[in-house]
């Protein structure tokens, strides 16, 4: 019998009939056996077919069979009822061999040309199955020449068997105090050849409680316990189960914090399996009880280990452990019953007493001393020489524990010294020199450093003077010793103060000329301000008004006298104001270069003379009151004049303070 | 040269009143404030007051307020310092001292001899 | 007031030998001043403002400092300087003295 080709050969050919395409002769037996490669199957059809037809195919016949199972006899040309000749059939062999048979009787009836069939391996897909058999695959099938492998979903592992997929279900650890548990796909069919372990493990107090709920359903056995599939429930105490069947298991009370669950499947049967749920019960604490002023939070029948319960207080309350104030308080329940934390108080927040008032003082509203949430206290300034700044002192003792002022301001009020003051009464003469009383010139400032010179006081903490007066100490601020509150010169009992820097005005060059004489001292500390240290006022835009030619303004000063010593005393002169032309014109003629008076300037003096700041009354002020707010500014500063001073028809030569209040204003905002 | 005389001792009945003397010389008197001091041997040095001796201006510490009573006489260039309601506290040696006027005005360039003032029945 | 507190009470030194006593202040002070007394006598200027030599005190003598601690040097003892130094300051009212330091010769 002539075999067919044998793998790895190429695997395809032709077959015919002996003698094809001629008659094939009687007594013919011809057998054909074509090899595939493994995981590959034989397709064959025919091209031409021709044989004697008789009943089932007795006489002559193509037999096809594949191992052991014969998968046609063939002959005639066409099938009937009870034959079956191949048309256009395509025959395929079950495994990857194939028998192919030809045989013929001792007679025909007439000549019959036989057949003529073509063959070829091709690959089997053994990921398709025939409706109502078992799949090849558990999962995933994937198809190959030659062959096909399984895969699982995320969560499964191909068991050894190469088909079935067992599922990754051991090692899940339940911590916390109550949940849901189930078998693998439920309430779908669970997975065969699994082995799941889990594990509940709580905190050691807890006992663990097991309910079996919806359905339960694993394969059992009537007369063996078990055998197939089975769960089963350990605890350090214990064993409960194997459980199988379907009837749900009753509730099981562990009296343990840990569980291990075990749930074995076989490799057959499709059942819905098992759900649990647990929940956990421990010791229960005290039940707790807010303090006055406070409330428990969340709020429960019972707590038990674990449990926590935080207390809140009322506004205007604050948490108090003993005497220790706390941010927030939370108990939690011990496993013997006990909570870990004492309870707080909620004690009424207490602001303390007030920070004192610079130059201020504070009063108790609610009560003498009472400083507790929605105490009132009023802040209010010294009287005459302080004025509180934007607000109206009226502090509440707010919940953050701090008091508050109407604004919402936490920040203490600002008292403000009071400017201008003076104990001097007006209209005084305007011929000689006069001694300055107690009072008179409260902003008077003595500079030491050097030189004597002299300045006003701004605010509590600058001074104001003429940039040549402190241009040499511009990098050594902290040489100037800056003295007030004294009219005698020598005098020790002075008040001291030290400069902390020196602001000369960018536009006044040293030497040249007297433009822009103006200079800013900043104390390296705030000066208490009385009846003898007060500051004078800055000019207000309406200042001119009381500027005007002829009007008096009152310069002071320890600067030269008559009799060309410095002053012992304060001394202090009234001289008006000089028209700007006139006093332009009286520094025109040498020795004094043209344009040395300028818009920056103002004069003051008599005609006549002898009355006129000198030598040592550098950077004083020229003051002049304001009618409307009857309170004293400055508006020029002691710069220059002529070299004898009180000179006839020479004046004293101020700078001319309004046209450098934005200049002011910003270096003392500034710093 | 600058100089300030002090009697050497005063000695005093308890309750009673002592006036001290400083006679200065060598100088301008008016021109220099006079400052007193008291000193004992435990307490040190104190400070009492001062007067200016151009217009008899005065400042006393507040504890000796009520104890001591600074004047000047400027005829004689004298500063004299008044004490009152002695008793054994009062004992010490009181010196007057010239206060300096180049540089901050607040200590003393001359000293007076001083005086021992002893307060005993 | 300031308390000016003088370290050591009482020390000695042999001629020749470098001193230096320390003034130590409550607050800070701008100035300091330093005066010797010997027994018998009325106190000396010998430094004012911190650091300068009043007239006539020998140049041995030298003061520094700032803030709350001021110190007195002498660099080299003598016989004559053997006396109790007292520091002093006013830049806060009243003005106080030191309780002094005694130097006695070795």
């Known amino acids: 019998t002539p075999l067919g080709p044998k793998w790895p050969e190429p695997v395809f050919g032709r077959l015919a009939s002996p003698g094809f395409p001629g008659e094939y002769a009687n007594d013919q037996e011809r057998r054909w056996t074509l090899t595939a490669p493994p995981g590959y199957r034989l397709r064959l059809y025919f091209t031409h077919f021709d044989l004697e037809l008789s009943h089932l195919c007795e006489y002559d016949f193509v037999k096809l069979s594949s191992g052991a199972k014969v998968l046609a006899t063939l002959c005639g040309q066409e099938s009937t009822d009870t034959e079956r000749a191949p048309g256009k059939d395509t025959f395929y062999s079950l495994g990857s061999s194939l028998d192919i048979t030809f045989r013929s009787d001792y007679s025909n009836e007439k000549p019959f040309t036989g057949f003529e069939a073509f063959y070829a391996a091709e690959d089997i897909d053994e990921c398709q199955v025939a409706p109502g058999e078992a799949p090849t695959c558990d999962h995933h099938c994937h198809n190959h020449l030659g062959g096909f492998y399984c895969s699982c979903r995320a969560g499964y592992v191909l068991h050894r068997n190469k088909r079935t997929c067992s599922a990754l279900c051991s090692g899940q650890v339940f911590t916390q105090r109550s949940g849901e548990l189930s078998s693998p796909e439920y309430p779908r069919p669970y997975p065969k050849l699994s082995s799941c372990t889990y594990s509940i493990s709580l905190e050691e107090g807890f006992s663990v409680i097991l309910d079996f709920v919806e359905s339960f359903d694993v394969e059992t056995h009537p007369e063996t316990l078990c055998p197939y599939d089975f769960l089963k429930i350990q605890t350090d105490r214990e064993e409960h189960g194997p459980f199988c069947g379907k009837t749900l298991p009753h509730r099981i009370e562990t009296k343990s914090n840990t569980v291990t669950i075990t749930f074995v499947t076989d490799e057959s049967g499709d059942h819905t399996g098992w759900k649990i749920h647990y929940t956990s019960t421990a010791q229960p604490c005290p039940y707790p009880m807010a303090p006055p002023n406070g409330h428990v939070s969340p709020v429960q029948a019972k707590y038990i280990l674990k449990d926590s319960f935080s207390i809140f207080c009322e506004t205007g309350y604050e948490l108090l452990q003993g005497h220790l104030p706390l941010k927030s308080f939370t108990a939690v329940c011990q496993k013997d019953g006990s909570w870990d934390r004492p309870m707080p108080a909620c004690s009424i927040v207490d602001c303390g007493p007030p920070d004192d008032l610079p130059s201020g003082r504070v009063e108790y509203i609610t009560g003498p001393g009472v400083t507790t949430y929605k105490a009132v206290i009023q802040y209010s300034c010294e009287e005459t020489f302080y004025t509180m700044k934007v607000n109206d002192g009226k502090y509440v003792c707010e919940a953050d524990g701090f008091w508050t002022s109407s604004k919402g301001e936490k920040s203490l009020p600002v008292c403000e010294p009071v400017c201008g003051l003076s104990a001097r009464t007006t209209g005084g003469r305007i011929y000689g020199g006069q001694k300055a009383k107690p009072g008179d010139f409260p902003w008077q400032v003595l500079i030491l450093g050097g030189t004597t010179a002299a300045g006003a006081l701004l605010y509590d903490n600058w001074v104001l003077t003429a940039a040549h007066a402190v241009y040499e100490q511009k990098h050594d601020a902290s040489a100037l010793d800056i003295r007030m509150g004294t009219l005698k010169r020598l005098s020790p009992h002075y008040t001291q103060a030290w400069s902390e820097a020196v602001f000369i005005h960018e536009g006044y060059t040293h030497d040249a000329g007297f433009d822009n004489d103006i200079a800013l001292i900043k104390l390296n500390n705030k000066v208490v301000i009385n009846s003898n240290i007060t500051p004078i006022c800055l000019p207000r835009k309406e200042a001119e008004s009381f500027m005007r030619t002829d009007d008096i303004g009152t310069a002071s000063g320890w600067g030269l006298t008559q009799r060309g010593f410095l002053a012992r005393n304060l001394m202090y002169v009234d001289i008006p104001i000089v028209d700007h032309q006139k006093c332009t014109a009286a520094y025109e003629k040498p020795p004094y270069p043209r344009g040395s008076v300028t818009a920056n300037m103002l004069c003051a003096g008599l005609e006549s003379g002898g009355k006129d700041s000198c030598r040592g009354d550098s950077g004083g002020a020229l003051v002049f009151l304001d009618s409307e707010t009857e309170r004293w500014f400055v508006g020029g500063i002691v710069s220059w004049g002529s070299m004898n001073c009180g000179e006839a028809g020479q004046y004293g030569v101020y700078t001319k303070v309004i046209n450098y209040i934005p200049w002011i204003e910003n270096i003392i905002s500034d710093f | 040269q600058v100089q300030l005389q002090q009697p050497g001792a005063e000695l005093v009945r308890p309750g009673s009143s002592v006036r001290l003397s400083c006679k200065a010389s060598?100088?301008?008197?008016?021109?220099?404030?006079m400052h007193w001091l008291k000193q004992r041997p435990i307490q040190g040095l104190e400070w009492i007051g001062d007067?200016?001796?151009?217009?008899?201006?005065?400042h006393y510490i507040e504890k000796f307020k009520d104890k001591a009573t600074l004047t000047i006489d400027k005829s004689s260039s004298t500063a004299y310092m008044h004490l009152s309601s002695l008793t054994s506290e009062d004992s010490a040696i009181y010196y007057c001292?010239?206060?300096?006027?180049?540089?901050?005005?607040?200590?003393?360039?001359?000293w007076g001899t001083g005086t021992t003032v002893t307060v005993s029945s | 007031q300031i308390v000016l507190t003088q370290s050591p009470v009482i020390m000695s030194a042999s001629p020749g030998e470098k001193v230096t006593m320390t003034c130590s202040a409550s607050?800070?002070?701008?100035?300091m001043y330093w005066y010797q007394q010997k027994p018998g006598s009325s106190p000396r200027l010998l430094i004012y403002?911190?650091?300068n030599l009043a007239s006539g005190v020998p140049v041995r003598f030298s003061g520094s400092g700032s803030g709350t601690s001021n110190s007195l040097t002498i660099s080299r003892m003598e016989a004559e300087d053997a006396a109790t130094y007292y520091c002093?300051?006013?830049?806060?009212?009243?003005?106080?003295f030191g309780a002094g330091t005694k130097l006695e010769l070795k």
């Open positions: 001292a010239r206060g300096d006027i180049t540089t901050t005005l607040r200590y003393f360039d001359v």
């Open positions: 060598g100088y301008t008197f008016t021109n220099y404030w």
């Open positions: 007067i200016d001796p151009s217009d008899s201006e005065t």
């Open positions: 607050s800070s002070v701008r100035y």
């Open positions: 403002d911190t650091s």
């Open positions: 002093q300051q006013w830049s806060s009212y009243p003005l106080t």
